[in-house]
Interface confidence: low
């Protein structure tokens, strides 16, 4: 999907309003600083792009983000503001359904949603223009 | 434990330059912004400029464009700050202080110790 | 340049009062951030985004306002409390208000 011309303002303030608080939730016992953010994106789209991938596809060691409550609330912004995204989005659901497994809280987990909130910080921050 | 550190009082004549140097430790300093402040004796605080470590990108106030430059050494994580053509004015502390996206808002959650700065002939 | 106007500039209170500080811009800005600083101190963040409360600040303060009219409230002045505070905003680069002292009575 193309994230080009999804409303980012209105992204963002979802993000503020709620999914952030909700990432924090998901960390919450965890030291800031216990993991390097090793993912990184240079414009919105793009941050978008990653934040989608490490959200909903499923990874070695962590195979349960999708039904957070984050994930849902991201799921829901991308809907609203990015035309078209739902429509992409109805057969990679249908696939996660059927391959859902019990909620697991893994170490692998916590560190992939800290790498989601450096993505967020990203994507809230456009960078200052070079001068 | 984020920490900013900054270099030593600096004493320096009208027409010089001063080099504040402010290193960085606890987070990746990548990913926040870093601002300079600062303040002459019994004066408001007063925003310089802000830079982003990620590229470089900079954004001055215009009261100083010009006379000020500011960049980062990444591979050191450490913020520095040049100010030109000094005037007995421009003494001052010179803060450092990284800008996190915590709440609503960019805010300067953590600040260097200051660096003071005298001009005078 | 958004210009921060805090008033007053001095407030002489005695310990167990109410303390109102107040900061308006020049023009509306989203949120307003506030900062305590002592002598000889650099700044420590106090309130972020007009009303949340920065990590350890007692429950006695807090922030409220919209657009160009923000305030700072302790609801009761304890010794530790007198100090410099200063507001700022970055709806337009970075601007901080000239302070408003709060001094023992």
């Known amino acids: 999907y193309d994230f080009t011309n999804c409303d980012f303002e209105k992204i963002k303030a979802a993000y503020l309003s709620t999914i952030s608080k909700d990432l924090i939730t998901y960390m919450s016992g965890t030291k800031s600083t216990e993991f390097n953010n090793t993912v990184s994106c240079s414009n919105r789209p793009h941050c978008l792009t990653e934040i989608q991938s490490l959200t909903f596809n499923p990874t070695a060691g962590c195979a349960s983000l999708a039904k957070e409550m984050f994930a849902m609330k991201t799921k829901a912004a991308l809907a609203i503001w990015c035309p078209g995204y739902s429509e992409t989005q109805i057969n990679a659901t249908q696939a996660m359904k059927k391959r859902r497994k019990r909620k697991v809280t893994t170490n692998k987990c916590l560190e992939q949603v800290s790498q989601l909130q450096g993505l967020w910080r990203r994507f809230n921050r456009p960078l200052l223009k070079q001068q | 434990e984020v920490q900013l550190v900054q270099s030593g009082a600096e004493v320096k004549k009208p027409g010089a330059s001063v080099k504040v140097s402010c290193k960085a430790s606890g987070y990746t300093f990548t990913d926040d912004y870093m601002n300079w402040v600062r303040q002459a004796p019994g004066q408001r605080l007063e925003w310089m400029g802000i830079i982003s470590p990620y590229n470089g990108g900079t954004s001055y106030n215009q009261k100083f464009k010009g006379r000020v430059t500011l960049t980062v050494d990444k591979s050191a994580s450490t913020a520095y700050m040049e100010l030109s053509s000094l005037r007995s004015e421009d003494t001052a502390v010179y803060y450092c202080?990284?800008?996190?996206?915590?709440?609503?808002?960019?805010?300067?959650?953590?600040w260097g110790q200051g660096t003071t700065v005298t001009v005078s002939s | 340049e958004i210009v921060l106007t805090q008033s007053p500039a001095t407030l002489s209170l005695s310990p167990g009062e109410r303390a109102t500080l107040s900061c308006r811009a020049s023009s509306s800005v989203s949120y307003m951030h506030w900062y305590q600083q002592k002598p000889g101190q650099a700044p420590r963040p106090w309130i972020y985004a007009t009303s949340n409360l920065a990590s350890g600040v007692p429950a006695r303060f807090s922030g409220s306002g919209s657009g160009t009219s923000y305030t700072l409230t302790i609801s009761r002045l304890e010794p530790e409390d007198f100090a410099v505070y200063y507001c700022?905003?970055?709806?337009?680069?970075?601007?901080f208000g000239g302070g408003t002292k709060v001094e023992i009575k």
């Open positions: 700022q905003q970055w709806s337009s680069d970075r601007t």
């Open positions: 202080a990284r800008e996190d996206y915590d709440y609503d808002g960019y805010a300067m959650d953590y």
